[in-house]
Amino acid sequence: MSSKYPRSVRRCLPLWALTLEAALILLFYFFTHYDASLEDQKGLVASYQVGQDLTVMAAIGLGFLTSSFRRHSWSSVAFNLFMLALGVQWAILLDGFLSQFPSGKVVITLFSIRLATMSALSVLISVDAVLGKVNLAQLVVMVLVEVTALGNLRMVISNIFNTDYHMNMMHIYVFAAYFGLSVAWCLPKPLPEGTEDKDQTATIPSLSAMLGALFLWMFWPSFNSALLRSPIERKNAVFNTYYAVAVSVVTAISGSSLAHPQGKISKTYVHSAVLAGGVAVGTSCHLIPSPWLAMVLGLVAGLISVGGAKYLPGCCNRVLGIPHSSIMGYNFSLLGLLGEIIYIVLLVLDTVGAGNGMIGFQVLLSIGELSLAIVIALMSGLLTGLLLNLKIWKAPHEAKYFDDQVFWKFPHLAVGF
């Protein structure tokens, strides 16, 4: 007999998700329309390709990257797709309401879809810390709260600090990481006896996680350059991101071997560390003037990522209940901070060079932006964590953490729950 959702969740999830979808359809009906302006086919295709790259990163890259659990790989991939689909819809509406609504209608362009996909990516990064411990109904709540918090953060930063799309979206790494970690902190932590094996990685899911990492690795330059203003900025961002991720791969594999007593390479380290350079150069990818600097940053990021993967999981497992293989949260929190610090260092160097007090003020503004991103991430993450703990969501029992059979129909299995 195939396993089923608990009866209450069977009632709750479809009703909750479909009611929400109906509400979104109504909002789209009343408040949105497509951009009707003329655009040539060539420009349209070029603009769409960037959005496509981002969707591949989100659906395949992050979907498979989180699928390394022995008995939770189906749920990881499919739940990621579910969250992406829902997140993009809500993000398009929210961004439109926050930035365009005074003009009456939200105009949907390819650029707004690009922005929405990047906002939804934030949830996919955060959810790595809680996947396996929550059901789809809870994930819907997480998507809504996180996309709303990120949208508001971006609007506040844009209005108060006068930063452009690229700069305020690059807080996504830090925001997503701290949001996810604070949600995880609120959820029930101890894994009961007999379920430890479920959060272990298995060979085939680990291979699919590596596939996810490869997709992310290939498309990270598109992510870092997607919101930049001009071809010269975008070109520089693509080059620098490519050099940084290339070096972080070499560093990740060799550093992983170095960190092991027998010189063996850890799959878990490599899955995450290959992306380290892309995250670290994110904020300043268009500002770095030469390849060697991007490569140095990729090297440093790779080392930090491997070091973090070696020493932080024990702490994260104890304090936050995050399994050893879910390393995206603390990895992105470290590397996102590194990226922000690199940008602040560039501003400090400007201040030293120019002896200009106003540039010093820019440094303070950047520190303020970063602090605001962390504070909003922690507060909204804690709020989400508290909401997810409510009984109405019928969260999976701790004994059924990290188990596909709680959520999926496997006709060939005769195991009942």
Partner: antibody, heavy 129, light 108 residues
């Protein structure tokens, strides 16, 4: 040579619509951001709108937001400004301008600069009843 | 939004004079400031970008300086063809490009 030519101006009643065009020649149009700037009679320059090189992003001055739409057709090397719900205060000479981007570098970072280096001759829009 | 304030709003000078026009931003714009010259009935013409870089073809008597919030345009030796209106413009914010109100330079 590099040239921008605006057309579509004229006399229009308040509340009506008008579409301005700007034909570009002598450069790779799809590689440049483009602006509309206007100048009311006897007044200074007022920036109206900008569109990015690939058409992915558009920004407007508060005074025209929700009424004017900037667009471009890179295959036709043409920039457009659709003006709806026109008011008397929209009476002005409208210029299209090319945005040039450049950068300078120190050893540790790049500095990007943007400026309007090529302007059209302007087209006059008069909103009057 | 960033506001740009030019001073003086009008200025009388003679050929050969050294003239300085100032532009102040309501917040730091680093070096993202451009200067334009406009003659009556004509389109504006770019003089200086990035606060101090002279556009090609512009005479070397024009120079720009400043960073942060305070900027100046200097004409070292005024020529008859320099009598026009001058505008500063910030490009720090990629979403709103603001011009100063203009400085009209007239013959004394």
């Amino acid at each position: 040579q590099v040239q921008l030519v605006e057309t579509g101006g004229g006399v229009v009643q308040p509340g009506r619509s008008l579409r301005l065009s700007c034909a570009a020649s002598g450069f790779t149009f799809s590689s440049y951001g483009m602006h509309w700037v206007r100048q009311a009679p006897g007044k200074g320059l007022e920036w109206v709108a900008v569109i990015w090189s690939d058409g992915s992003n558009k920004y407007y001055a508060d005074s025209v937001k929700g009424r004017f739409t900037i667009s471009r057709d890179n295959s036709r090397n043409t920039l457009y400004l659709q003006m709806n719900s026109l008011r008397a205060e929209d009476t002005a000479v409208f210029y299209c301008a090319r945005e040039q981007g450049g950068y300078s570098s120190s050893w540790y970072r790049r500095y990007y600069y943007y400026y309007m280096d090529v302007w059209g001759q302007g087209t006059t829009v008069t909103v009057s009843s | 939004d960033i506001q740009m304030t030019q001073s003086p709003s009008s200025l009388s000078a003679s050929v050969g004079d050294r003239v300085t026009i100032t532009c102040r931003a309501s917040q730091s714009i680093s070096s993202w400031l451009n200067w334009y010259q406009q003659k009556p009935g004509k389109a504006p013409n770019l003089l200086i970008f990035a606060a101090s870089t002279l556009q090609s073809g512009v005479p070397s008597r024009f120079s720009g300086s400043g960073s942060g919030t305070d900027f100046t345009l200097t004409i070292s030796s005024l020529q008859p063809e320099d009598f026009a209106t001058y505008y500063c413009q910030q490009s720090y914010s990629s979403s709103v490009y603001t011009f100063g109100q203009g400085t009209k330079l007239e013959i004394k």
